[in-house]
Structures are given as C-alpha cells and as structure tokens.
Amino acid sequence: AGVFELQIHSFGPGPGPGAPRSPCSARLPCRLFFRVCLKPGLSEEAAESPCALGAALSARGPVYTEQPGAPAPDLPLPDGLLQVPFRDAWPGTFSFIIETWREELGDQIGGPAWSLLARVAGRRRLAAGGPWARDIQRAGAWELRFSYRARCEPPAVGTACTRLCRPRSAPSRCGPGLRPCAPLEDECEAPLVCRAGCSPEHGFCEQPGECRCLEGWTGPLCTVPVSTSSCLSPRGPSSATTGCLVPGPGPCDGNPCANGGSCSETPRSFECTCPRGFYGLRCEVSGVTCADGPCFNGGLCVGGADPDSAYICHCPPGFQGSNCEKRVDRCSLQPCRNGGLCLDLGHALRCRCRAGFAGPRCEHDLDDCAGRACANGGTCVEGGGAHRCSCALGFGGRDCRERADPCAARPCAHGGRCYAHFSGLVCACAPGYMGARCEFPVHPDGASALPAAPPGLRPGDPQRYL
C-alpha cells in the first residue's frame, strides 16, 4: 500500500506565440482545480478508460480575476498535494492524465459552472520511495509544470511497496525461518521480495522471488560479471570464473549510471540521479518515445526532431492534445443557441432545444403567444412549442372559438338530467339522489350520507353546479 503524490508547480501560458486568453475576467471571476487519473502499465488506453490505479481531485484554488489588458499569467493554484492512495503493490509503470478545470464564479443559475481548460497525459516508469520526478507538459497554448512520486505507507517498503511485515500467527514467536520484524514487536518478517541471495547491488526484482540482473551482470543471483571487452580495464580483483575483472567494493565505482547520470550510494545498493530526458534504474531509458506508444485514440506517432520533443502525435479527426488524449470539444464553442444542450456525437453535433425553440441550433423561437389571440376572453399560455389557450367558461377549442356544450360529457350521475346554463350546467337529480352531480344517494329516512343538503334545497331539487 502507498500513495501517489502530485504537486502542481504552475499552470500558465506556454512559451512561444499565441498566448492564451485568461480564463477568468472581471465579469467572470474563476478559480482552478485539478484532477489526476492513474492507470497501471504502459498499455494503450483511451483517455476515457477507467482510472484503475485511482484518481484524485485537488482543492479549489484562490479566486482569480484578470486585470484588463494584461496577458494571462501563471494562474493561482490550490494548496497542497493531490494524493492517490493505492492499496496493492505499486506497478512501477503507469499512465497519467492531469486535467485542469475552471470553476466560474459569476452569477450562475444553479451554482458554479465547470469547464475543462486543459488535459495532459503521459506514461512513465517510477519506483516507489524514489525522489520527486519533475515534468512539464503542454496542452495547446497552456503549460503545466508538476512533480510526482510514489511513496509507501509504512510498514510497506520497497520500489513496489510490497508489504514485508505481518502480524504474528502465534503470540510468542515467528514462524520457521522468519524473524521478528523489529522494531515492530508484534509483527514478523515476511519472506524477502527478491530471490534469497539476489545481489543487492547488481540485481533487482519486480515480482516476489525473482532476481533480474543489471547490465553487465549475470547468473541466478546476478553475482557473475558478464565477460565483455570492458573486462580488460582493471577495476578490481580478478574473477576466476570468467577471467573478468569484478568492480571494486563501491557500488558507484565505475559509475553504473548511463547517459550522464550521477551515482549515489544507498544503504545497500546505489541510486542514479538522471539528467533531463532519461530515467530508469541506471538512466538507461530515454524520455518517452514512439516505442512507448504515447499517442491515445489511434494517433499516429512520429519521432520528434529535437531532444525536448522525443515524439509528436498526429491526431485523428475529433481528437487533439500532445497525446491525442483530448476529444475535440466542439461544444465549447457553444453552438446551441437559446440555452440548448450541446451533444458532441463524434460524427456530428446535436442540439437538444429548450421548450419553445427549434432548429438545428435551436435558433427558431416558437414563442407560442406572439401575434396570436385567444377568442372569447381566453388567455394564451406558453409551453412545449405548441400554443395553447386557456378558455373562458363555455368556450373551448384551440383558439376558444368553439362554444362548449357543458352537457356533452354527461356529467350528471345516476340518471340525472343535464341543463345548459349561462354560468355552467345544472343537474336535475333522479329520485333518491342529490348533489351537484347527483352523486350522493339519499337515505330512506331522509338523512343524506354525504354531505348535508345546502339550506333552501330539498333532496330531489335541481342542484346547480357552480
């Protein structure tokens, strides 16, 4: 178990022409926040695939308002680290996506509005417990500078954070061949990650029980130097097994770090600090190239012309970004008018229009009542793109032009007779029934069940429906 930590140093205009417009303005102040998405391995995955290693969201940054006429500066950032906890072993190789989001703080109806400003992606090799790795990524005219590292949560340690101590199974002693995990008194050592006897200076492992050799070393425990021409330059005592000269006692003797990396001794091995553009245990891996498959979404990778640009991705239609990781957001141009909802279907744009609007871009205003009148005192009601009249009593139809027959629907129950009246309708109830619609039976003793007859009306009298 452990935590991947991301520290954003700056987000602002990149070098070169075409500085971006500030995302915030006096009319529309905003603040930034960041999202990181991690995926294991260097697999070819679309930007939309799940963040299998985890994801994290930063706090909101300080509110920023652009100064009129000033170019977009580096924008104020949120405090703190983005932390992505991982429960299992750290995979060593991973893909990342870092998104910069803008939160607009103007007078928004229904709360703040969020929009994606930039998205960068990359693939890296990283050992847990190592130093902060620095990186710069560009997305359009924006540049993001950040550092990241993976660290283990004690008592897990190592380049993969493989847990090495576990609770005792018995209260008094550890199992056969295992020692107490001092100073964790109540825990016992788990078997060492690498194969027993694997050279700490010339071997390493990524899976429990294996022993993989660094360049120049061989044998099951990486203790046998490879016989090459470099053996001719004396650097230490001769090895009888190969006739080769074994390096001296210091792990940095002869500098095992390639490509100008500097070597420092660690408690049991060595560590290379690599120059920009190189990484790996011995700085043997150059910056990401086409061989690493850095282009998402079917982008075509072409080798870059300068060291700072090891590759260039030529993106297919509908995608952009240095790694083709960003779907071209044609909706960001807000093509749907009158508050229509924009849907980018990839092959086409669709606008879902609000009620009262129509057209490919919701440009047609279906103002129901404009220039229309409802007859006979009816009132026009807007809604749903179909004009509707609320008619006065006694009238109906689309424009209230039709005289309504209130008795057409046979409103009088239990055989009551209906009479049209200037103010509505009147029901003459059959014997034994009463009520405005003749809906209540009259009890034989003359008491009504529900409700009492109004004063001045006897059961059987016509009941006017008001």
Partner: antibody, heavy 124, light 106 residues
Amino acid sequence: QITLKESGPTLVKPTQTLTLTCTFSGFSLSTSGMGVGWIRQPPGKALEWLAHIWWDDVKRYSPSLKSRLTITKDTSKNQVVLTMTNMDPVDTATYYCARIVSFDNDVVSAMDYWGQGTLVTVSS
Amino acid sequence: DIQMTQSPSSLSASVGDRVTITCSAHSSVSYMYWYQQKPGKAPKLLIYLTSNLASGVPSRFSGSGSGTDFTLTISSLQPEDFATYYCQQWRSNPFTFGQGTKLEIK
C-alpha cells in the same frame, strides 16, 4: 534481549590505527536483514555516521573517511570490527555501534539498538 | 551530501507543553528517523520510517512529513523528555544526522 558493547583503546596517539570491536548478543549477522553500524560523536557535537556492514557482507563507508576505514564481521563470534588509520586529535569522540535492520533490499527500517559507547581520545 | 537542518537548535519549554521540532533535508528523502539522547548516554531510537513509534516509546511522541520537511512532535512534555533530539536520513551516503535540538526546562 539485544545488547551491543564497544571495546578498544581509550587513548590513541596521532597517526596510529584505532581498532574497535562491537560484540553483540540477541541477534545474528547470519540472519538476512541484519546489519551493524558505527557512529561517533565528538564531545558536545552532533552524531556522525561512519560505516556499516550487512549480513551478506555489503559494506558502506562515509565518503570523507573511506580511505581510512575498514569494517569487517565475524559472524561466529557475533562481532564487528572497525579499524581507522592515521588517527588525528579531531577524531577524539565517543564511538558507538548500533544494530541496523532492513526488511527491504534497500530501505533501512531502523537503527534500533545502540551500545553504550566508548570514548576514544587522540593525543600525543 | 544531503544536509539535515534542525530547527530550533535549542528550545526552552515547560512540562505539559506541546513541542514541535522540524528537520529539513536539502534534497528529498524517502523516510526520516528520530533519536533522543540524554547527557552521557547513547542515543535511543524514537521514530523510524517517518511516523512509526519505536518499541517502548510513549505515544505522546509522533513523527510526520515527506519529501524535504519532517516534524517530531511531543504532545505533552514530561520531565523525562528534556534531552537532545536528532533526525537522520538513510537515503544517500553519507547517511547524515541533523545538528541536534536541545530541549531544556524553562
């Protein structure tokens, strides 16, 4: 119960070689993950790491003293020996040995048990 | 060399006080280790792997931090806590200690 004890001369002349022995009990240097280190402390000053040795004979020396230091172990006797050549009055210090534990190929878990220390004075 | 700078160098406090000692590494280290030393005695391990309490150390001691900045905190000082405290890194040879922080009774 884990104990460590330093032994060696208390007074050394300049240019002489100092040999210090650390005798320990309660753990073994044949057990993987175990190491023994030497640390010194001049009077009234901070601690300074000198050297350490691991169960598999991997050794580390302070770069500033590397040419003068040698560390060896005798697993059967539960002893670690540090020799320091060409002693100088500035080497006057209390010398400690301590157990070091590593449960990973390259991460120290702790330097958890220390000897009581032995004061070595370098003077003519 | 990774230099370790402790602050403050000395500190006066009273029993019951909350005390914080910081250790700043001049370059990033994976873990920090803290020791307590009393006059005439050997150092004693307090905290290992940044935040783990060594065996027998009271829970009022705690460690935290990452990268270059680490902290040792004593939540409520006890009379036996007045001593000198050292931090140490095991990242890169030489495996350096801080210059020490002397904690005295006010």
